[in-house]
């Protein structure tokens, strides 16, 4: 059985403009640290999609270290008590409350770098992360709604006469499946307990001059295209798996 062919120009494309994939850090350059910071910095929240199994670095507001009293990271993950990592500059002391995930750590010593790192991002790291910089002039916050992205496994096969099935298995968020040319399609979604979604699109082409069909899977982690030849052989089951 022949494998479905990838369209290389589309397969796993990543664009530098794609906020989700451009970088695993949203940190500012040290030169941008504000010495006369303004209340504009007081509360910033960012939605940040991050690919699973990558490393992520989350940053505090750009406040000069000499103005700091305390740095705190509050981490709220689904189904877990709020974890707090705090550093008190005066005593060079760190404290942790309810923090059990050893992959979530300070990047280095907090007195040198207030950033937080997640090593090998997992689905369980989905949640809200907030840095609180306590200064004499008030508290300055930067929050991240971290959305962990899981690349779906894509398969394409023909299961009946002039009917093809394209599946994007266990993606996060759900992938979007489209076909060229368009056919008579039905799409179903299956939700898994770990937050991933399997999308299955079944299409039938009545028109006999359609011999090759392409399944295009769009996802935040990148796009994939596969094509398959429709063989009108009764009982034939042509199968292919993405490589």
């Amino acid at each position: 059985e022949g494998a479905a062919q990838p369209n290389n120009s589309l397969m796993l494309q990543t664009s530098k403009e794609n906020h989700a994939l451009a970088s695993s850090s949203l940190c500012m350059d040290e030169k941008q640290i504000t010495q006369n910071y303004s209340k504009v910095l007081a509360e910033v929240n960012t939605s940040w999609p991050v690919k699973m199994a990558t490393n992520a670095v989350l940053c505090c507001p750009p406040i000069a270290l000499r103005n700091l009293i305390i740095i705190t990271w509050e981490i709220i993950l689904r189904g877990q008590p709020s974890c707090t990592k705090a550093y008190k500059k005066e005593t060079n002391e760190t404290k942790e409350t309810n923090c059990t995930d050893e992959r979530i750590t300070w990047v280095s010593r907090p007195d040198q770098n207030s950033d937080l790192q997640i090593r090998t991002v997992a689905i369980t790291h989905d949640g809200y992360y907030r840095c609180i910089m306590v200064t004499p002039d008030g508290n300055f916050h930067r929050g991240y709604h971290l959305q962990v992205l899981v690349t779906p496994e894509v398969t394409l096969f023909q299961n009946r006469n002039r009917t093809a099935v394209c599946k994007a298995v266990a993606g996060k968020p759900a992938a979007h499946i489209s076909w060229i040319p368009e056919g008579d399609c039905a799409t179903k979604q299956e939700y898994w307990s770990n937050g991933t979604v399997t999308v299955k699109s079944t299409c039938h082409w009545e028109v006999h001059n359609v011999s090759t069909v392409t399944c295009h899977v769009s996802h935040l982690t990148g796009n994939k295209s596969l094509y398959i030849e429709l063989l009108p052989v009764p009982g034939a089951k042509k199968s292919a798996k993405l490589y």
Epitope: T84, E90, I132, V134, T135
Partner: antibody, heavy 124, light 107 residues
């Protein structure tokens, strides 16, 4: 039991400096906690002025930043307030106080021990 | 700065009654509010911290509630020694700020 007691002149002339002492007994100020000055104006309004930490670092209310200095004498277990260029608006009862410490140190800036306060009038 | 608005300024009640004092913050201070009692010639007394945590030695007739911007101190079954001046204080951020005070008097 920790006790705090304020002392200093009850009358200060405008444009001069106000200097107060807080004497602490029952605890060594270099062993822990933050040690604050708080004042209560006529009419009952309260203002936190600043603190000196047990390591000697200071944090001041930005509204007083240019005029305030909090220092200490570890040998005498005392800490001090100096407020420069006073005006009649600085007339108040001045309290020293000790911060509380919980299991986490980010939100523990409230006060479980206070001095009774010393009244300071600024007048010519 | 976080402005703390306390109400009422004055309150008169009789022993055995219940009273409530309110404190409103100009911005979200989460749960980080303390309540104090002041009496003439005595050191200020910390009653409650973190919105609802009773300080050791605070009688159980005192209770604190609220979150974000709106907080309440409730005293049930007033005792004669409960009369005095009450203050709220936010301990969420610097500069630390206080309410304007509530004078609780015997009716």
């Amino acid at each position: 039991e920790i006790q705090l007691q304020e002392s200093g002149p009850g009358l200060v002339k405008p444009s001069q400096s106000l200097s107060l002492t807080c004497s602490v007994t029952g605890f060594t100020i270099t062993s822990g906690y933050d040690w604050s000055w708080i004042r209560k104006f006529p009419g009952n309004k309260m203002e936190w002025m600043g603190y000196i930490g047990f390591s000697g670092s200071t944090v001041y209310n930005p509204s007083l930043n240019s005029r305030i200095s909090i220092t200490r004498d570890t040998a005498k277990n005392q800490f001090f307030l100096q407020l420069n260029s006073v005006t009649t608006e600085d007339t108040a009862t001045y309290h020293c106080a000790k911060s509380f410490v919980q299991n986490t140190f980010i939100y523990d800036w409230f006060f479980d021990f206070w001095g009774p306060g010393t009244m300071v009038t600024v007048s010519s | 700065d976080v402005r703390m608005t306390q109400s009422p300024s004055n309150l008169a009640a009789s022993p055995g009654e219940s009273v409530s004092i309110n404190c409103k913050a100009s911005k979200n201070i989460s749960k980080y509010l303390a309540w104090y009692q002041q009496k003439p010639g005595k050191a200020n007394r910390l009653l409650i911290c973190s919105g609802s945590t009773l300080q050791s030695g605070t009688p159980s007739r005192f209770s604190g509630s609220g979150f974000g911007t709106d907080f309440t101190l409730t005293i049930r079954n007033l005792e004669p020694e409960d009369f005095g001046l009450y203050y709220c204080q936010q301990h969420n951020e610097f500069p630390l700020t206080f309410g304007s005070g509530t004078k609780l008097e015997i009716k």
